[in-house]
């Protein structure tokens, strides 16, 4: 597994990570940590593992956290109720 750096699919990344689009270069995917408490997220980001190529630059939230709306267009990882 690639612990950090370029990837193509989730299976190439270590635990607690996903293969997300780089925020600097859209054509590159990098192993990215899953969302921690308070991190920005998107509720439709594919769960881990995803067997295709992601389009989002964020990973889903860590287990035990959910991607919840805090305002009209803002979602963050919060503890599941």
């Amino acid at each position: 597994a690639v612990i950090t750096g370029a990837c193509d699919k989730d299976s190439q990344c270590g635990g607690g990570m996903c293969c997300a689009v780089s925020i600097w270069v859209k054509s590159i995917r990098i192993c990215t940590p899953m969302g921690k408490l308070g991190d920005s997220c998107h509720p439709l980001t594919r769960k881990v593992p995803f067997f295709g190529r992601r389009m989002h630059h964020t990973c889903p939230c860590l287990p035990g956290l959910a991607c919840l709306r805090t305002s009209f267009n803002r979602f963050i990882c919060l503890a599941q109720k």
Partner: antibody, heavy 121, light 111 residues
């Protein structure tokens, strides 16, 4: 060749439940999510929900929450849609459709032939 | 829910001419520079068929006379040169917010 083969037409009474099956072949079943969509006679398309065939996690259209259950049997590569408390407005063709794995663009690239569910007293 | 409104409801075009279908979302379906909009074709008695995903990406095996464009709330499906086999109903679908919602459909016929 990817194929999704659905179960046959059903006629149900109001208040009853129906369970529609969708048997997949020609690809690795657990690598792709499965959606369910319905189409009332002469009407447009309505998304019901989808399931991760790998993990079994589901996302439902809130309109159907509490009445719909989507499940998979990995051993037979089959997805199921169960809809309870049927009413006449549920009369429709129900389709299963494979997600194409195009990242977060949840696009349905292969569809079953459809199952007509008629709800009538 | 995001409401998708297609125009026109129906369209009659001569063979070989251009057909244009519009789809307007009640709010933006963009995220992080991508547009989360798909287009499907449905012929009578058949299930829908995916044509375009993520606004402008042509599905494998779909003729290149089909193209998609747009961003934000306004999207277009174009058939550059209408063929007899393109007679169908076309649907847009947003996939940026749950529940995924479809437009009401646009019927394309031969003039």
């Amino acid at each position: 060749e990817v194929q999704l083969v659905q179960s046959g037409a059903e006629v149900k009474k109001p208040g009853a439940s129906v369970k529609v099956s969708c048997k997949a072949s020609g690809y690795s079943f657990t690598d792709y999510d499965m959606h369910w969509v319905r189409q009332a006679p002469g009407q447009g398309l309505e998304w019901i929900g989808y399931i991760s065939c790998y993990a079994g996690a589901t996302t439902y259209n809130q309109k159907f929450k509490g009445r719909v259950t989507i499940t998979v049997d990995k051993s037979t590569s089959t997805a199921y849609l169960e809809l309870s408390s049927l009413r006449s407005e549920d009369t429709a063709v129900y389709y299963c459709a494979r997600d194409g794995n195009y990242g977060e663009a949840y696009a349905m690239d292969y569809w079953g032939q459809g199952t007509l569910v008629t709800v009538s007293s | 829910d995001i409401v998708m409104t297609q125009s026109p409801d129906s369209l009659a075009v001569s063979l070989g001419e251009r057909a244009t279908i519009n789809c307007k979302a009640s709010q933006s379906v963009d995220y992080d520079g991508d547009s989360y909009m798909n287009w499907y074709q449905q012929k009578p008695g058949q299930p829908p068929k995916l044509l375009i995903y993520a606004a402008s990406n042509l599905e494998s095996g779909v003729p290149d006379r089909f193209s998609g464009s747009g961003s934000g709330t306004d999207f277009t499906l174009t058939i550059s040169s209408l063929q007899a086999e393109d007679v169908a109903v076309y649907y847009c679908q947003q996939i940026n917010e749950d529940p995924f919602t479809f437009g009401q459909g646009t019927k394309v016929e031969i003039k």
